[in-house]
């Protein structure tokens, strides 16, 4: 009951090209310690979309202040959506490790579909 769950509340999200897409994710616990990452796709070929710990992701903003104490909301917004952004996005919790963090639990994924820009 108390073990961390990764909640991605939407199975799918549809956004018009040029708009921003909000992908929601939350954790039910602060434990274990470790960062969260967002990926597009699953398996070995997945693409890193956002890393809470490091990196530069100019199109991605976090919906809430991730440095805020006890924050459990890891939702992101991706700006200027194009058809190339379509796919399934996974919010993944990592457990702090040495030398590398270890994947702990993944959300069930949210499929982003992109509609044509309204004329």
């Amino acid at each position: 009951e108390d073990e961390l769950q990764v909640i991605q509340p939407e199975k799918s999200v549809s956004v018009a090209a040029g708009e921003s897409a909000t992908l929601r994710c939350a954790m039910t616990s602060l434990i274990p310690v470790g960062p969260i990452m967002w990926f597009r796709g699953a398996g070995a070929g997945r693409e890193l979309i956002y890393n809470q710990k490091e990196g530069h992701f100019p199109r991605v903003t976090t919906v809430s202040e991730l440095t805020k104490r006890n924050n459990l909301d890891f939702s992101i917004s991706i700006s200027n959506i194009t058809p190339a952004d379509a796919g399934t996005y996974y919010c993944v919790k990592f457990r702090k490790g040495s030398p590398d963090d270890v994947e702990f639990k993944s959300g069930a994924g949210t499929e982003l579909s992109v509609r044509a820009k309204p004329s």
Epitope: I7, P9, S12, A26, T28, D73
Partner: antibody, heavy 119, light 107 residues
Framework: QVQLVQSGAEVKKPGSSVKVSCKAS????????ISWVRQAPGQGLEWMGG????????NYAQKFQGRVTITADESTSTAYMELSSLRSEDTAVYYC????????????WGKGTTVTVSS | DIQMTQSPSSLSASVGDRVTITCRAS??????LNWYQQKPGKAPKLLIY???SLQSGVPSRFSGSGSGTDFTLTISSLQPEDFATYYC?????????FGGGTKVEIK
């Protein structure tokens, strides 16, 4: 066994407000949304709005926008629905229901709170 | 908002009958469709979620089908305890909306 316990029946004057509570026990409050559904005498079910406590966000049916406020207190596992500017047509049974993310079905219901609006 | 139209609004049937209730959405909702049963003076009870998944503890005589805009709830052999009102609910968030209900009465 998950239970939702609602506050008792209310009799209100037109123009006043009512606040109904819904306390969850036996489950993980933050893992679900809470919906509020009302049923006027002899009528069908009407979704008023819902809250995702872990995200701190509420959504409302257009019909009730500006007149209903749904909040949640995670520390007490309690959700609240406040309806203002009451009129006789608001006489109804008000239900809270645990709502599962992704498929948004309501699998656990409170017993209902009868609100009577009468001068 | 997505409108949900249920038909019929009421029906009379006998114990053992096969009963079919339909629900139509005003736009495609994929399989985001749930069904509930409600008896007088009681809270609704979930029967079917995601169009065709049977909720735990619900008898197998209840089944759901459909996708897109057209959905069906079927009771394969009506039992005395099944006389109630049935509601569909679309779950293509948000806002959630219910159908108007179908009252199943004893013939």
């Amino acid at each position: 066994q998950v239970q939702l316990v609602q506050s008792g029946a209310e009799v209100k004057k037109p123009g006043s407000s009512v606040k109904v509570s819904c306390k969850a026990s036996g489950g993980t409050f933050s893992s679900y949304a809470i919906s509020w559904v009302r049923q006027a005498p002899g009528q069908g079910l009407e979704w008023m709005g819902g809250i995702a406590p872990i995200f701190g966000t509420a959504n409302y049916a257009q019909k009730f926008q500006g007149r209903v406020t749904i909040t949640a207190d995670e520390s007490t596992s309690t959700a609240y629905m406040e309806l203002s500017s009451l009129r006789s047509e608001d006489t109804a049974v008000y239900y809270c229901a645990r709502t599962t993310y992704r498929d948004y079905y309501m699998d656990v219901w409170g017993k209902g709170t009868t609100v009577t609006v009468s001068s | 908002d997505i409108q949900m139209t249920q038909s019929p609004s009421s029906l009379s049937a006998s114990v053992g009958d096969r009963v079919t209730i339909t629900c139509r959405a005003s736009q495609s909702i994929s399989s985001y469709l749930n069904w509930y049963q409600q008896k007088p003076g009681k809270a609704p009870k979930l029967l079917i979620y995601a169009a065709s998944s049977l909720q735990s503890g619900v008898p197998s005589r209840f089944s759901g089908s459909g996708s897109g805009t057209d959905f069906t709830l079927t009771i394969s052999s009506l039992q005395p305890e099944d006389f109630a009102t049935y509601y569909c609910q679309q779950a293509y968030p948000y806002p959630l909306t219910f159908g108007g209900g179908t009252k199943v009465e004893i013939k």
